[in-house]
């Protein structure tokens, strides 16, 4: 299996909400001896490998933001801790999983990584990750809503309809 990142770059104004998304692709074994562990973290573009380093997102570690289940089951993070930090990670039945960040600030800018670990019981673990950049902008140059750039090409897409501005 692989992990696809539909968008490689998200450009958002301060105060906006955004949902970063990854998608599990390829054959997914739904047998009893396979489970999936999914999580999110911040990282840096390392010289050797992107997403190697695991940094917290708004002080929450990858341990705090994980989802643990079989195959394409739906799941959500433990709400309380994440929601207190304006975060929520979720997974649906179709292999999509995401992290939603509310009320963005300039400090949220950086590289974000989704990680999937396929656990084949009594055999091995297979890890794959996806990376995407979040740029939070302020001032007159900032877009009015989040603009996303697909991974395959640099055609931008406005995602106003899906992500409503945070009201204070």
């Amino acid at each position: 299996f692989k992990v696809a990142t539909p968008y490689s770059l998200y450009v958002c104004p301060e105060g906006q909400n955004v949902t970063l998304t990854c998608r599990l692709l390829g054959p997914v074994d739904k047998g009893h001896d396979v489970t999936f562990y999914k999580t999110w973290y911040r990282s840096s573009r390392g010289e050797v490998q992107t997403c190697s380093e695991r940094r917290p997102i708004r002080n929450l570690t990858f341990q705090d933001l994980h989802l643990h289940h079989g195959g394409h089951q739906a799941a959500n993070t433990s709400h309380d801790l994440a929601q207190r930090h304006g975060l929520e990670s979720a997974s649906d039945h179709h292999g999509n999983f995401s992290i939603t960040m509310r009320n963005l600030t300039l400090l949220d800018s950086g590289l974000y990584c989704c990680l999937v670990v396929e656990i084949r019981h009594h055999h091995s673990e297979h890890r794959v990750h996806g990376a995407m950049e979040l740029q939070v902008q302020t001032g007159k140059d900032a877009p009015s809503n989040c603009v996303v750039y697909p991974s395959s090409s640099q055609e931008s897409e406005n995602i106003t309809a899906h992500h409503h501005h945070h009201h204070h």
Epitope: D33, T35, Y37, V48, Q49, S52, Q63, H66, H68, S78, L115, V117, I119, H121, H122, H123, S124, E125, R127
Partner: antibody, heavy 118, light 107 residues
Framework: QVQLVESGGGLVKPGGSLRLSCAAS????????MSWIRQAPGKGLEWVSE????????YYADSVKGRFTISRDNAKNSLYLQMNSLRAEDTAVYYC???????????WGRGTLVTVSS | EIVLTQSPATLSLSPGERATLSCRAS??????LAWYQQKPGQAPRLLIY???NRATGIPARFSASGSGTDFTLTISSLEPEDFAVYYC?????????FGQGTKVEIK
């Protein structure tokens, strides 16, 4: 604070049994895989057994398979290791440690000493 | 079972010197390797994860590299508190295995 505390170690005769416990606090125990790792006096570390966050699957080292049983009670934030048919070579400090898929042992207890001797 | 061989068994150095520890795997473990530090009477502490990344709170004098079968842990300038035993551990396959350890002692 975030910690693991082992108990239940002691002196036991060859062929005897012992049950070790590990009490977790300061983190969401039910989120984590848990392992037992041992260290014979003056020797290196040996992974013994691991249990997933939900209690299944379970893994054992060949050296203890059929003799040791790992279990957990998420409601009590506790991990256990039932050790039967103990041998002199099982003498060691036994540590419990937390783990996650694609991760490592990032929190360890202080250990409990098991001595198997006649 | 993947066997991890650490060398040297003992490293005798003075504070301020550079320490280089090696860990070799009997087959590839990709980058799924960690380093731990253990002081007498204490539990091990995670230093490095995924071959080259410092765990939370680990000083910058600790660095590591490698992938596949050959890995290195480097302590750029030894502090008195760094004299301890260091273990590598792989999680590429079951069972989880550790190296036999390298003792870094004061010369």
């Amino acid at each position: 604070q975030v910690q693991l505390v082992e108990s239940g170690g002691g002196l036991v005769k060859p062929g005897g049994s012992l049950r070790l416990s590990c009490a977790a606090s300061g983190f969401t125990f039910s989120d984590y895989y848990m392992s037992w790792i041992r260290q014979a006096p003056g020797k290196g570390l040996e992974w013994v057994s691991e249990i997933s966050n939900s209690g299944s699957p379970i893994y054992y080292a060949d050296s203890v398979k059929g003799r040791f049983t790992i279990s957990r009670d998420n409601a009590k934030n506790s991990l256990y290791l039932q050790m039967n048919s103990l041998r002199a070579e099982d003498t060691a400090v036994y540590y419990c440690a937390r783990d996650l898929p694609g991760w490592y042992f990032d929190l360890w207890g202080r250990g409990t000493l098991v001595t198997v001797s006649s | 079972e993947i066997v991890l061989t650490q060398s040297p068994a003992t490293l005798s150095l003075s504070p301020g010197e550079r320490a280089t520890l090696s860990c070799r795997a009997s087959q590839s473990v990709s980058s799924y390797l960690a380093w731990y530090q253990q002081k007498p009477g204490q539990a091990p502490r995670l230093l490095i994860y995924d071959a080259s990344n410092r765990a939370t709170g680990i000083p910058a004098r600790f660095s590591a590299s490698g992938s596949g079968t050959d890995f290195t842990l480097t302590i750029s300038s030894l502090e008195p508190e760094d004299f301890a035993v260091y273990y590598c551990q792989q999680r590429n396959n079951w069972p989880r295995t550790f190296g036999q350890g390298t003792k870094v002692e004061i010369k």
